[in-house]
Interface confidence: low
Amino acid sequence: QLPPGKPEIFKCRSPNKETFTCWWRPGTDGGLPTNYSLTYHREGETLMHECPDYITGGPNSCHFGKQYTSMWRTYIMMVNATNQMGSSFSDELYVDVTYIVQPDPPLELAVEVKQPEDRKPYLWIKWSPPTLIDLKTGWFTLLYEIRLKPEKAAEWEIHFAGQQTEFKILSLHPGQKYLVQVRCKPDHGYWSAWSPATFIQIPSDFTMND
């Protein structure tokens, strides 16, 4: 029977800069029941606070709701593991909410083959930002990436769309069924998961771009 091993805070993420969650990995339990607590203070403050919500984020997590989340303050946090034989502490982690945003995937992905009479045909893709991202506040510059591939192909073709919420692709294989997905990231954060795939059948008379 031993004191617990050193825990590690391994990830913090925010869907929208209004709330965030941090997760830790327990160390060894020393063969005894072990309690974990996360404490934090804001940079420039000495007052320590305990995690406000151990439930929302699931096991070994701390969730910071709106009232505990400040955009321009750095949080300094650590996890304490305690059993009957003693305690151990994680390293301190410095968290700035601005840099841990991982949005939900974009919404309403729509894909259409356009075949104008006077120009090359193309694939037109459009989508909406995730609704949790409040673009009216100016907090976010969202960047988008599209991937697509023929249904049976192994490799994805990647296109960076910048801040646009629509995109045109000219070079496609006629007669193929394509999968299309889109994801987004804020300028300083993490890529979202890919949106659910949308399928589109490219007509056999689709002319490849020269």
Partner: antibody, heavy 116, light 107 residues
Framework: EVQLVESGGGLAQPGGSLRLSCVAS????????MSWVRQAPGKGLDWVGN????????NYVDSVRGRFTISRDNAKNSLFLQMNSLRAEDTGVYYC?????????WGQGTLVTVSS | DIQMTQSPSSLSASVGDSVTITCRAS??????LDWFQQKPGKAPKSLIY???ILQGGVPSRFSGSGYGTDFTLTISSLQPEDFATYYC?????????FGPGTKVDIK
């Protein structure tokens, strides 16, 4: 319940100044951008500008840039609009508003009249 | 600046009618659009954000749709308390801009 209460409106001379205040309650003021919107008598709504949570960034409509200044005091849950070089066309009701994720909340407004 | 236009500028309708108001943006604004209701002497009230998402507490007879440049607000069965002026607003780029409003009054 979200509440926003504006004050400081009144009569000002052309070229004069006024300072509007807005006191917020019912939400974490320091977490949100805040906006000012105005409405001339019998007319539609015009966005004036907004300010970031920590006061480090402001945006303005061209017609007020250089004359109006938006500021805030998070310790007092207060938003301000300093209006200088006032013109007749600045007359109207001035609303402060929060830009919350799920829509906006507005105060009841304060009337500014610019007239000689 | 992005210009917002609304049509009609006013309309007369009866209780129980279905009413549709159109808002058009001068350039693509994706779904960065709000709808507001304003009654005389009162502050505007947020009805819909992100073009189609109903604000909490707003009756389900209100609905919004559209993407890009063309948007609509529909009131499926007009109630006495719905007689008011309705504004759209884009928040895609600064400065945020409102439509000129549509006044809905009693026929």
């Amino acid at each position: 319940e979200v509440q926003l209460v504006e004050s400081g409106g009144g009569l000002a001379q052309p070229g004069g100044s006024l300072r509007l205040s807005c006191v917020a309650s019912g939400f974490t003021f320091s977490t949100y951008w805040m906006s000012w919107v105005r409405q001339a008598p019998g007319k539609g709504l015009d966005w004036v500008g907004n300010i970031k949570q920590d006061g480090s960034e402001q945006n303005y409509v061209d017609s007020v840039r250089g004359r109006f200044t938006i500021s805030r005091d998070n310790a007092k849950n207060s938003l301000f609009l300093q209006m200088n070089s006032l013109r007749a066309e600045d007359t109207g009701v001035y609303y402060c508003a929060t830009l919350l994720t799920k829509g906006d909340y507005w105060g009841q407004g304060t009337l500014v009249t610019v007239s000689s | 600046d992005i210009q917002m236009t609304q049509s009609p500028s006013s309309l007369s309708a009866s209780v129980g009618d279905s009413v549709t108001i159109t808002c058009r943006a001068s350039q693509d604004i994706s779904n960065y659009l709000d709808w507001f209701q304003q009654k005389p002497g009162k502050a505007p009230k947020s009805l819909i954000y992100a073009a189609s998402i109903l604000q909490g507490g707003v009756p389900s007879r209100f609905s919004g749709s559209g993407y890009g440049t063309d948007f609509t607000l529909t009131i499926s069965s007009l109630q006495p308390e719905d007689f008011a002026t309705y504004y759209c607003r884009q928040y895609k780029t600064y400065p945020f801009t409102f439509g000129p409003g549509t006044k809905v009054d009693i026929k």
